[in-house]
């Protein structure tokens, strides 16, 4: 009927729509390396999954070019704050691309949670959420960084996480 | 032309893409029950809607299996804080499934907003946003909980809400 | 084969799925007008883009009716707080429609960040994120407002931004 090629494309697209790229990675004991590198993530256990995206050393890697809503939440907390900690904690999503030698800032938040302790208690908790749409080419990577990562609290993968899906 | 079955599927899919499951539920005076249960939500009035998802006693219920971006924001506020309140407020999204007897934590935040009052004023406001991709089977439910829910401020459905859409 | 019309629609839809409306606008030096109007945004440079949505005087404008996940983040910060500043900062997404004379609140957050300075430092940082699904008709607009906008910190488009995509 002359529609063969397009038909195959449509069939393929129907399948790929069911497989629209998406991922949700969760915090784990190994997430905080202390090495100055990005946070590392669980990709398979519990709530974590990869569908049409790859993972490599803390990075989500695009297999298909397009616009992605990327997001990350980190749970921050402590009893007081480390001496020498600036009054700012920075949580950001960064892109790695073969086209530039350095990581590119995508979405960034700065917070001053250490002043949040209630009277007579030095315990504080805070949470930082980032989300936004960015363009990724095939092979480009997105990572999460937190400075100072010592203040990230990990427990069970529900409080600190990292994900994306194509829009 | 031999494409009948697939054709019907495609036609169906076109319709269902227009009806990609999505919902946005808003806070209302009845949201806070004080019963220890999850928050309840407005499903029809104002900005609230359900499209391809059901609602039951505070829960969004999946009609179609797949990955969903689920989100919730709660507006917190008060003049000082209740005694006996730990310095933590917990805001979370939880899954109910016939496969487990207990709710499963999906996305959780902890915050210490009570220490945020400005000098001489005990008034404080804080907002907690959660969002992430989770897998839901048909009939599985997602609810929102806040501990201590007495600190959730409801007004007009714009400050505290709960939603989802399939990705 | 009697499927002509539907076939064309499907082909069209395949193309438009690739062009599912999406946008991400970034903060710039010109974002804060001090005029009492909404924040203005960069639409082309750096990470900013428009795909199937228009922009006009701070507003994202829908070209296609449907449900959109809209989001905004603003970076707040300062050294102390302006005298006369209420202990509340309001960050909101608002809809403009020909059907009403006034803007309609969609998603709103209130925060009290000025009390967040750490001991011995009056410097504070805070971030507010909003996101949720709303329905937009063709020509309806969404804008971002922050009261008091003097506390919004702009730098490079990564800390304060505004976006949307159809779900």
């Amino acid at each position: 009927d002359g529609h063969g090629g397009s038909w195959e494309q449509l069939i393929q697209e129907r399948r790929s729509h069911q497989n629209n790229p998406a991922a949700h990675l969760t915090g784990a004991n190994s997430s905080l390396t202390g090495s100055g590198g990005p946070l590392l993530w669980e990709t398979q256990l519990g709530l974590a999954f990869l569908r049409g995206l790859d993972y490599h050393d803390g990075a989500l890697v695009a297999n298909k070019a397009g616009y992605y809503y990327i997001y990350s939440k980190v749970q921050l907390g402590g009893v007081g704050c480390p001496l020498g900690l600036a009054s700012t904690i920075t949580h950001g999503l960064y892109k790695r691309t073969p086209r530039y030698p350095e990581e590119l800032e995508l979405l960034v938040s700065q917070q001053s949670p250490c002043g949040r302790a209630t009277s007579n208690s030095r315990v504080w908790w805070d949470s930082s959420f980032l989300g936004g749409v960015v363009h990724l080419e095939v092979g480009e990577e997105v990572v999460v960084r937190v400075l100072d990562e010592r203040l990230v609290r990990l427990r069970d993968g529900t409080r600190s996480y990292f994900g994306a899906f194509m829009v | 032309d031999g494409h009948g079955g697939s054709w019907e599927q495609l036609i169906q899919e076109r319709r269902s893409h227009q009806n990609n499951p999505a919902a946005h539920l808003t806070g209302a005076n009845s949201s806070l029950t004080g019963s220890g249960g999850p928050l309840l939500w407005e499903t029809q009035l104002g900005l609230a809607f359900l499209r391809g998802l059901d609602y039951h006693d505070g829960a969004l219920v999946a009609n179609k299996a797949g990955y969903y971006y689920i989100y919730s924001k709660v507006q917190l506020g008060g003049v000082g804080c209740p005694l006996g309140l730990a310095s933590t407020i917990t805001h979370g999204l939880y899954k109910r499934t016939p496969r487990y007897p207990e709710e499963l934590e999906l996305l959780v935040s902890q915050q210490s907003p009570c220490g945020r009052a400005t000098s001489n004023s005990r008034v404080w406001w804080d907002s907690s946003f959660l969002g992430g991709v989770v897998h839901l089977e048909v009939g599985e439910e997602v609810v929102v909980r806040v501990l201590d829910e007495r600190l959730v401020r409801l007004r007009d459905g714009t400050r505290s809400y709960f939603g989802a859409f399939m990705v | 084969d009697g499927h002509g019309g539907s076939w064309e629609q499907l082909i069209q839809e395949r193309r438009s799925h690739q062009n599912n409306p999406a946008a991400h606008l970034t903060g710039a030096n010109s974002s804060l007008t001090g005029s009492g109007g909404p924040l203005l945004w960069e639409t082309q440079l750096g990470l900013a883009f428009l795909r199937g949505l228009d922009y006009h005087d701070g507003a994202l404008v829908a070209n296609k009716a449907g449900y959109y996940y809209i989001y905004s983040k603003v970076q707040l910060g300062g050294v102390g707080c302006p005298l006369g500043l209420a202990s509340t900062i309001t960050h909101g997404l608002y809809k403009r429609t020909p059907r009403y004379p006034e803007e309609l609140e969609l998603l709103v957050s209130q925060q009290s960040p000025c009390g967040r300075a750490t001991s011995n430092s009056r410097v504070w940082w805070d971030s507010s994120f909003l996101g949720g699904v709303v329905h937009l008709e063709v020509g309806e607009e969404v804008v971002v407002r922050v009261l008091d906008e003097r506390l919004v910190r702009l730098r490079d488009g990564t800390r304060s931004y505004f976006g949307a995509f159809m779900v």
Epitope: T118, S119, N120, S121 | G77, G78, V79, G80, C81, P82, L83, G84, N120, S121, R122, V123, R150, R153, R155 | -
Partner: antibody
Amino acid sequence: EVQLQQSGAELVKPGASVKLSCKASGYTFATYYMYWVKQRPGQGLEWIGEINPTNGGTIFNEKFKTKATLTVDKSSSTAYMQLSSLTSEDSAVYYCARGNWPYWSFDVWGAGTSVTVSS
Amino acid sequence: DIVLTQSPASLAVSLGQRATISCKASQSVDFDGDNYMNWYQQKPGQPPKLLIYAASNLDSGIPARFSASGSGTDFTLNIHPVEEEDAATYYCQQSIEDPWTFGGGTKLEIK
């Protein structure tokens, strides 16, 4: 019955200190903040400060920050206020009162302790 | 500090009539629709007694002849019908900002 029982009247010399007590009964001590209020003869009421009985955290009226010290003994459900460097301006009746979130009203008051500063 | 100005300083009301006491705050005591204004009654030689919390809510055990209203900066306490035992000094108090402050008091005398 909910009660706040305050210690008896005090006659003290200028420059001295005095410690007043307020014993709570009929409710769980740790679930209400304790407040102290001053009333000079024939005058109005002044809020001195509060103490959180769970952790000893205090908030003061700036005017009384160097004058008053608030403490609690959870084991005996008793709150204390020590007043130091007393002058004739400190001669007053001092009340303890309990209150709580969300509206911070003082719903139960002690009978008051009269403090007279005189040489 | 938030200054609470009560008026009148004193008033005399006949038995069975209405007593109205005003309390004006130097700034709003509203938070998200709740008003952090409380009213107390004090009789000579006794501690104050809570009558009204959050601008208009009657404390438990307080007779219904006491009522109060207001929002923002202007508040009113009403007693109707006035009884003999209502002779006392009445104070308003704000609890939204430190230091918590009291009005100067209004002395009610029964004629």
